[in-house]
C-alpha cells in the first residue's frame, strides 16, 4: 500500500509495526476470552513454518503519547489508543488441546476522542 | 479489551468490520507485490477448515467519509484512510505453487493530516 | 443475573426491512460476541449472523448482503438489520450470548413475512 | 461446511430410562462441541460445552462424552421436565457455527 508520509501526510497518532514470532508472543487471547499457548511451528508439507504476526500498536516514544495530531484542542480530549483484530495462529488451550484458533493481535493506532466539558 | 465507546469516545475515523471468506476475496498481493489466489480451504490433521479474514476497513456510509471527526480545521486537511496490514494465508501464484504466503488485508481506518498551505 | 431481551419482531410484506433489536444486562457486554439465531416454525436452529467482541460482524449464506449486524456496547444493545425479507425469512429470532458456543439466550422475537 | 447429523430423530422413551443421543460429525471437530435442551415455547438452554464440561447449573445426570467426529449425549433416570429437543453444535470450524438437526425426546 502507498505510504502517507511520501505524500506529505502526517498520522494522527504515531504508530510502530514490527514482526513478532510465537516465540515473541508465547500466550495470547483466543475468540472464547481464554488464554492459550501459541506454538512455535506449524506443520505444512514438507516441513515447518515459524509462526510469524505482524503487529502495529501505538508507538510510546512518539510525539503523539499525549495524545492525538491535529486535534482541535478546544473542543476535544484525545488519546491515541492500540486497536485488536483476530487472526488464525496454531495454539493450544489449558486442557492442552492443540488447533487452530482466532486470537486477538494488535493491528492499529486510531485516535479517540472525548468531548471537553464545562467551557 | 476496553471499550471505547462505553467510556462515551469517538473514534476520530469510523470503521467496519466482517469476517471475509476466501470465496469473497479471490484473490489478494502478496508480499512481494505479486496477486495469487486465495485458497478457500486449509487442510488439517483429519479434515479442512474454510479461509476466514477478519478485516477492517473505512466505513463508505460513516460521518467521517468527508474527513476525520475532530480535526483543527484551521490548520489541517485530513482523511480516513484504510491501512492494511499482513497475515498468513494459504495460496496459489501464477505459476500454480501452492504454499502459505503473508498476504495484504484490510485491518483498520487511520486519520491522515496535511498542513493547510498559504495561510 | 444475565438477561437478553429481543425486540422488533412482527408481521411484514416480502421485500420489506426490519429491525431487531437485543437488550443485554448483568454482564460485561462489550466483552462478549454476540449472536441471532432463528428457527422457523416447526424447524431447527439456524445461525443468521453473529458479531465478535471487537465489532466484526459475520453473516450466513442466506442473509449475506440483506443482513446488518451491529452493536452499540455504550447501551449494552445489539441490532440485526434485515433488509428485502423473504418468506422464509419466517422465523423466531433468539439473540443469544457467546463467540463459540451459547451460554444466554433471550426468549425469542417472531418475524412473519407475508403478503 | 461441516455437517452434523443427529439421530435418532424422534426418541420413545418412559421417565427414569437412560437415554443416549448421538451426533456425528462429517469431519473433526475435536472436542469443540457443545449440547443444548430445548423445550417447546422457550428458548434452547446450554447443557453441555467442550464436549463434555456440564454449564452452570446443569443437573449431574446430564453428561457428555467423544471427540474427533463421534459425541453422545447421556440422559441417566431420564425426568419428566427432559422431554424436549436437544441440538449439538460444533464451534470448531468457526465460522460458520452448525448445529445438528435436534432429536426429539418424548414420552412413551
Known amino acids: 500500500h502507498s505510504d502517507p508520509a511520501r505524500r506529505g501526510e502526517l498520522s494522527v497518532c504515531d504508530s510502530i509495526s514490527e514482526w513478532v514470532t510465537a516465540a515473541d508472543k508465547k500466550t495470547a487471547v483466543d475468540m472464547s476470552g481464554g488464554t492459550v499457548t501459541v506454538l512455535e511451528k506449524v506443520p505444512v508439507s514438507k516441513g515447518q513454518l515459524k509462526q510469524y504476526f505482524y503487529e502495529t500498536k501505538c508507538n510510546p516514544m512518539g510525539y503523539t503519547k499525549e495524545g492525538c495530531r491535529g486535534i482541535d484542542k478546544r473542543h476535544w480530549n484525545s488519546q491515541c489508543r492500540t486497536t485488536q483484530s483476530y487472526v488464525r495462529a496454531l495454539t493450544m488451550d489449558s486442557k492442552k488441546r492443540i488447533g487452530w484458533r482466532f486470537i486477538r493481535i494488535d493491528t492499529s493506532c486510531v485516535c479517540t476522542l472525548t468531548i471537553k466539558r464545562g467551557r | 479489551h476496553s471499550d471505547p465507546a462505553r467510556r462515551g469516545e469517538l473514534s476520530v475515523c469510523d470503521s467496519i468490520s466482517e469476517w471475509v471468506t476466501a470465496a469473497d476475496k479471490k484473490t489478494a498481493v502478496d508480499m512481494s507485490g505479486g496477486t495469487v489466489t486465495v485458497l478457500e480451504k486449509v487442510p488439517v490433521s483429519k479434515g479442512q477448515l474454510k479461509q476466514y479474514f477478519y478485516e477492517t476497513k473505512c466505513n463508505p456510509m460513516g460521518y467521517t467519509k468527508e474527513g476525520c471527526r475532530g480535526i483543527d480545521k484551521r490548520h489541517w486537511n485530513s482523511q480516513c484512510r484504510t491501512t492494511q496490514s499482513y497475515v498468513r494465508a494459504l495460496t496459489m501464484d501464477s505459476k500454480k505453487r501452492i504454499g502459505w504466503r503473508f498476504i495484504r488485508i484490510d485491518t483498520s481506518c487511520v486519520c491522515t493530516l496535511t498542513i493547510k498551505r498559504g495561510r | 443475573d444475565v438477561q437478553l431481551v429481543e425486540s422488533g419482531g412482527g408481521v411484514v410484506r416480502p421485500g420489506e426491512s426490519l429491525r431487531l433489536s437485543c437488550a443485554a444486562s448483568?454482564?460485561?457486554?462489550?466483552?462478549?460476541?454476540m449472536t441471532w439465531v432463528r428457527q422457523p416454525p416447526g424447524k431447527g436452529l439456524e445461525l443468521v449472523s453473529h458479531?465478535?467482541?471487537?465489532?466484526?460482524?459475520y453473516y450466513a449464506d442466506s442473509v449475506k448482503g440483506r443482513a446488518t449486524i451491529s452493536r452499540d456496547n455504550s447501551i449494552d444493545t445489539f441490532y440485526l438489520q434485515m433488509n428485502s425479507l423473504r418468506a422464509e425469512d419466517t422465523a423466531v429470532y433468539y439473540c443469544?450470548?457467546?463467540?463459540?458456543?451459547?451460554?444466554?439466550w433471550g426468549l425469542g422475537t417472531l418475524v412473519t413475512v407475508s403478503s | 461446511e461441516i455437517v452434523l447429523t443427529q439421530s435418532p430423530g424422534t426418541l420413545s422413551v418412559s421417565p427414569g430410562e437412560r437415554v443416549i443421543l448421538s451426533c456425528r460429525a462429517s469431519?473433526?471437530?475435536?472436542?469443540?462441541l457443545a449440547w443444548y435442551q430445548q423445550k417447546p415455547g422457550q428458548a434452547p438452554r446450554l447443557l453441555i460445552y467442550?464436549?463434555?464440561t456440564r454449564a452452570t447449573g446443569i443437573p449431574a445426570r446430564f453428561s457428555g462424552s467423544g471427540s474427533g467426529t463421534d459425541f453422545t449425549l447421556t440422559i441417566n433416570r431420564l425426568e419428566p421436565e427432559d422431554f424436549a429437543v436437544y441440538y449439538c453444535?460444533?464451534?470448531?470450524?468457526?465460522?460458520?457455527?452448525?448445529f445438528g438437526g435436534g432429536t426429539k425426546v418424548e414420552i412413551k
Open positions: 443469544a450470548r457467546g463467540n463459540t458456543f451459547f451460554d444466554y
Open positions: 448483568g454482564f460485561d457486554f462489550s466483552s462478549y460476541g
Open positions: 458479531i465478535v467482541d471487537l465489532g466484526g460482524g
Open positions: 469431519q473433526n471437530v475435536r472436542s469443540d
Open positions: 467442550d464436549s463434555s
Open positions: 453444535q460444533q464451534y470448531y470450524d468457526w465460522p460458520p457455527l452448525a
